[in-house]
Interface confidence: low
Amino acid sequence: AGVFELQIHSFGPGPGGAPRSPYSARGPCRLFFRVCLKPGLSEEAAESPCALGAALSARGPVYTEQPEAPAPDLPLPNGLLQVPFRDAWPGTFSLIIETWREELGDQIGGPAWSLLARVTRRRRLAAGGPWAGDIQRAGAWELRFSYRARCELPAVGTACTRLCRPRSASRCGPGLRPCAPLEDECEAPPVCRAGCSLEHGFCEQPGECRCLEGWTGPLCMVPVSTSSCLGLRGPSSTTTGCLVPGPGPCDGNPCANGGSCSETPGSFECTCPRGFYGLRCEVSGVTCADGPCFNGGLCVGGADPDSAYICHCPPGFQGSNCEKRVDRCSLQPCRNGGLCLDLGHALRCRCRAGFAGPRCEHDLNDCAGRACANGGTCVEGGGAHRCSCALGFGGRDCRERADPCAARPCAHGGRCYAHFSGLVCACAPGYMGARCEFPVHPDGVSALPAAPPGLRPGDPQRYP
């Protein structure tokens, strides 16, 4: 057992980030943070529960944003975020920190929450070690924080799996290690040999690396082969002098929290005590009081560890803990080729020319279903359809390449150039304008000290 502690140092715009508050013109608000811990370094499914635990910070001080003021570091809640863990500290874990903004204006139905930033870090961390600092960017925001894991007595060690007992305690009990010579006290964990496995090794003296059952090698990285068990299914332990089973599916009892293991073909099954669940009974009896629902999800049931909780997720989120943002645009709400934009608080459709409405559902002309290629625009006239083609294209459906300068748009000897954003005319001396159609009056005087960047006399008049 132990506690994961997170200290937020600052949250604000990062270097090169939003120079002004992106929430200007809103009323007073305050920040709070959510932390979610998941075991392992693997890319877990986003909706997997916060199996190691979750915590919610207190609300920070009320902050009224100034529309024209630069966004400062925002005022933070006081104190640590603490996530207790009942079982072994896994050493490798995923840390998810969410920064939430609570608007305190006159909201219908109470305060409005919005997620400002989410950072996810996969880390190795030994329990009992010093604070680890980190700086993470999320969009234009920057979050500075420190974290550590510490064991709570009587647990000790880098995984909080060693239990401090009087020296008389058995040396062969499962998972037990003798304490320091001083009666009923635990010594500070020694520094193990560099590279010693956090999961499978431990040390009682600085510089050593001693292996847990089932593992061997100088750094405890090598699983013990079952073929070496020679009928006993295991060699004598080099760490205790006791005979221990070799690595079968239930060896070392993979079931946490007092779960009992039974072997199945090629695997195992845990029967968990009340209040625990999961493949290895690693998920403790989370209740709604633990705040397991992210992103404003509503927790129901789960009043005690024996009853399961259910998270009812707000629009835009899903998963057992509402951790996963729904791709709302995958529902394709925009018709007629409109582009779907998820603005966070709402969806918006950016409509193609000729269409309008919240879902681009209104046809503005009789060109619906008419496809003009290469950026051409369908235009109506007398009930007939036709395409008005973009520069460089022609034909009935704008599928044929055309020389945009073939029409000789530049007057008075100007030279035509096709530019990605249109035609430009390089005018002969004495002429100006989009098509060099205007003679330059001799009274013309420069109003600015320099030509546009890269533009010289005789260069195109229309600089992109």
Epitope: S388, A434, G444, S446
Partner: antibody
């Protein structure tokens, strides 16, 4: 929001000069040509000339050569049109208008107009 | 200078009618023409550029067509707020020139 705000109405005597201002906002002034167009009472629109604020280049319609002067002050995003040696047939509403600087662009925004009355 | 000749000079139609205004250039201007709407006492408002492209915010009942020397502005279903004078303008060559205008009224 694109806005072109012109100075107020003027009453002038024949032979005098008038200077009308046009303050631009809501867009980058130096990226657009600024045109001046006038409209006599009950008549059509008549193009007078243009100025390109970026470079100060100007072009006048032949009819107004020698009588009209177009200037800009880029520091305050303002264009000016001065018409001298006024005659009674110069009585009109004078408009400033902007035009983007690509081949396809037409005049797209107009000021509200300034009525200049020339009367003895 | 390029002359722009509009017809008719005025017309009266009923709400919902299809209205067509034509503009003829004295020489080929490609599709470099624009159409403007001017309501009484107001400044002109741009409707169409490059002969057939509507500006943002212009109702879809307004459409333009034509190229070379002959151009048309069509109001597919006349509305009371369309009462105005409509001008064509070529911006192909200097000096820019306008048609003399077509005054549209409701019957």
């Amino acid at each position: 929001e694109v806005q072109l705000v012109q100075s107020g109405a003027e009453v002038k005597k024949p032979g005098a000069s008038v200077k009308v201002s046009c303050k631009a906002s809501g867009f980058t002034f130096t990226d657009y040509y600024m045109h001046w167009v006038r409209q006599a009472p009950g008549q059509s629109l008549e193009w007078m000339g243009l100025v390109y604020p970026y470079s100060g280049d100007i072009s006048y319609a032949q009819k107004f050569q020698g009588r009209v002067t177009l200037t800009v002050d880029t520091s305050i995003s303002t264009a000016y049109m001065e018409l001298s040696r006024l005659r009674s047939d110069d009585t009109a509403v004078y408009y400033c208008a902007r035009q983007g600087n690509y081949v396809n662009n037409a005049i797209d925004y107009w000021g509200q107009g300034t009525l200049v009355t020339v009367s003895s | 200078d390029i002359q722009m000749t509009q017809s008719p000079s005025s017309l009266s139609a009923s709400v919902g009618d299809r209205v067509t205004i034509t503009c003829k250039a004295s020489q080929n201007v490609g599709n470099i023409i624009a159409w403007y709407q001017q309501k009484p006492g107001k400044s002109p408002k741009a409707l169409i550029y490059l002969a057939s492209y509507r500006y943002s915010g212009v109702p879809s009942r307004f459409s333009g067509s034509g190229s070379g020397t002959d151009f048309t502005l069509t109001i597919s279903s006349l509305q009371p707020e369309d009462v105005a004078t409509y001008f064509c303008q070529q911006y192909s060559d200097s000096p820019y020139t306008f048609g003399q205008g077509t005054k549209v009224e409701i019957k």
